[in-house]
């Protein structure tokens, strides 16, 4: 009566670059099975209620199940197994022919890694700082990796950037973006995105720090030529980017077509899906070839607005032209004209 | 903080019918699913039904067709109603929850009840 359910159950999530997505494999007494998604009657395209895996997703320290389903590139390790009886179960399965096995995908999301360092460097004086400088995102309290306010750390010299609207600092930007490994800079944060304002349940030790940095060359490759120390401002705004390495991404799936890759597009806002809206900013492919990619599916064949004559359609919109550029969604109440995307599928 | 609390159980002949409860309370925007388990006395705890968020159930072997698992998304409550009950039943049932924080980005971690304790006699 094994069952994915059990506490001692183990499964890994193979061939992505993430612990939290890839091919399920689970171990067995013999050792590590991948999975089949013909497993327990289904058929291999079948995409299933992603929260019956939850367990799994809790056991490998990740978040919620987004999706659970054929994982379109198969690589087929030495042993495959095709599972019977309830969704999840593992207490009859037998061996797959390879070939005849497409593997089961799980994609569960990977929670931002935001949390500072338990303790900061304590402010000083003196001596002058000897270690490497650093620098850190601080999002705030569930906020997304990538996303925050900028801290640099000299030696134990550490605190927030002064920064004035007027500044012209876009290289500097892509520079600190990249050496944070969160790609190239999309945009400054308000305060209140960034998360400046102290959280009444944040522990004593990440308060704003003592010292605070100015910018000092915009144009610095390396980073202890980017700032000077300042007296710290007791108002005024301290810089907080939004690097394009953002995590959650916006999730997208195609509803309502005859098969995974065609639908009606859906994003996840949260744990609801909803209707992403048309619009105008995003009338060329390029935003539907990325919802083809996610889905792991070929380009795009074609896309059509649905026409939004109820005045009561809602959904969501995104303002970029590409979704992985959008880091927030916003509610369309009315008039939400919806987008039907027909993606090549690769196993027609 | 997340609390979970069960409540129903007690003692009920062969052949009768129980109804537990459990309610999730705190911050529990994002439950993923929420389970029931049992436990034996000498024996390891077992999962005995399984709810989601998107309504899939999943029934252990020895329960389908006599238990019933369901729930009132509102209350973030989850009732286990159990029929045709047998002395083999006779356990402590734990509610469990799997529940991300951080408005559904966080980690996905498991809360567990107290237990509530059911006795079926010959």
């Known amino acids: 009566r094994l069952s994915w359910y059990d506490p001692d159950f183990q499964a890994r999530l193979t061939r992505s670059n993430s612990k939290c997505q890839g091919q399920l494999e689970v171990y067995l007494k013999d050792g590590w099975h991948m999975v089949c998604s013909q497993s327990w009657g289904r058929s291999s395209k079948q995409w299933e209620d992603p929260s019956q895996a939850s367990k799994v997703c809790q056991r490998l320290n990740c978040g919620v199940p987004l999706s659970l389903g054929p994982f379109l590139v198969t690589y087929t390790p030495q042993s495959s197994i095709i599972c019977y009886g309830q969704l999840g179960s593992f207490s009859n399965c037998s061996h797959s022919r390879n070939d005849m096995c497409h593997s089961l995908g799980l994609t569960c999301l990977e929670p931002q890694k935001t949390t500072p360092p338990t303790t900061r460097p304590p402010p000083t004086t003196t001596p002058e700082p000897t270690a490497p400088p650093r620098l850190q995102l601080v999002a705030q309290s569930g906020g997304q990796h990538c996303a925050g306010v900028v801290e640099f750390y000299s030696g134990s010299l550490g605190g927030t950037i002064s920064y004035e609207a007027q500044d012209k600092t876009q290289d500097l930007e892509n520079f600190l973006c990249n050496n944070l490994q969160c790609g190239s800079f999309l945009k400054h944060l308000p305060e209140t995105e960034a998360g400046r304002a102290q959280d009444p349940g944040e522990p004593r030790e990440h308060q704003p720090l003592p010292i605070q940095w100015k910018i000092q060359n915009s144009s610095c490759t390396s980073l202890e030529h980017c700032f000077r120390k300042i007296k710290p401002q007791k108002s005024g705004r301290v810089l907080a980017l939004l690097c394009s390495g953002f995590q959650p991404k916006v999730q997208s799936r195609l509803v309502g077509g005859s098969s995974i890759c065609e639908g009606t597009v859906e994003v996840r806002q949260g744990a609801q899906w909803a209707a992403l809206c048309d619009s105008s900013s995003a009338r060329s492919s390029l935003r539907w070839e990325e919802v083809c990619r996610e889905q792991q599916c070929g380009s795009v064949n074609s896309y059509r607005v649905l026409d939004a004559g109820d005045p009561t359609s809602r959904g969501l919109f995104c303002p970029h032209q590409k979704l992985s550029q959008c880091h927030e969604l916003w509610e369309r109440n009315s008039y939400c004209k919806k987008v039907f995307v027909t993606c090549q599928d690769p196993n027609p | 903080e997340v609390q979970v609390v069960e409540s129903g159980g007690g003692l009920v002949q062969a052949g009768g019918s129980l109804r537990l409860s459990c309610a999730a309370s705190?911050?529990?925007?994002?439950?993923?699913?929420m389970y029931w388990y049992r436990q034996a006395p000498g024996k390891a705890r077992e999962m005995v039904a399984a709810?989601?968020?998107?309504?899939?159930?999943y029934y252990e072997d020895s329960v389908m067709g006599r238990f019933t698992i369901f729930r009132e998304n509102a209350k973030n409550t989850v009732y286990l109603q159990m029929n045709s009950l047998k002395p083999e039943d006779t356990a402590v049932y734990y509610c469990?929850?799997?529940?991300?924080?951080?408005?559904?980005?966080?980690?996905?971690?498991?809360?567990w009840g107290q237990g509530t304790q059911v006795t079926v006699s010959a």
């Open positions: 469990n929850a799997d529940i991300a924080g951080h408005n559904c980005s966080g980690y996905l971690k498991e809360y």
């Open positions: 705190g911050d529990t925007i994002c439950i993923s699913a």
């Open positions: 709810i989601t968020s998107g309504g899939s159930t």
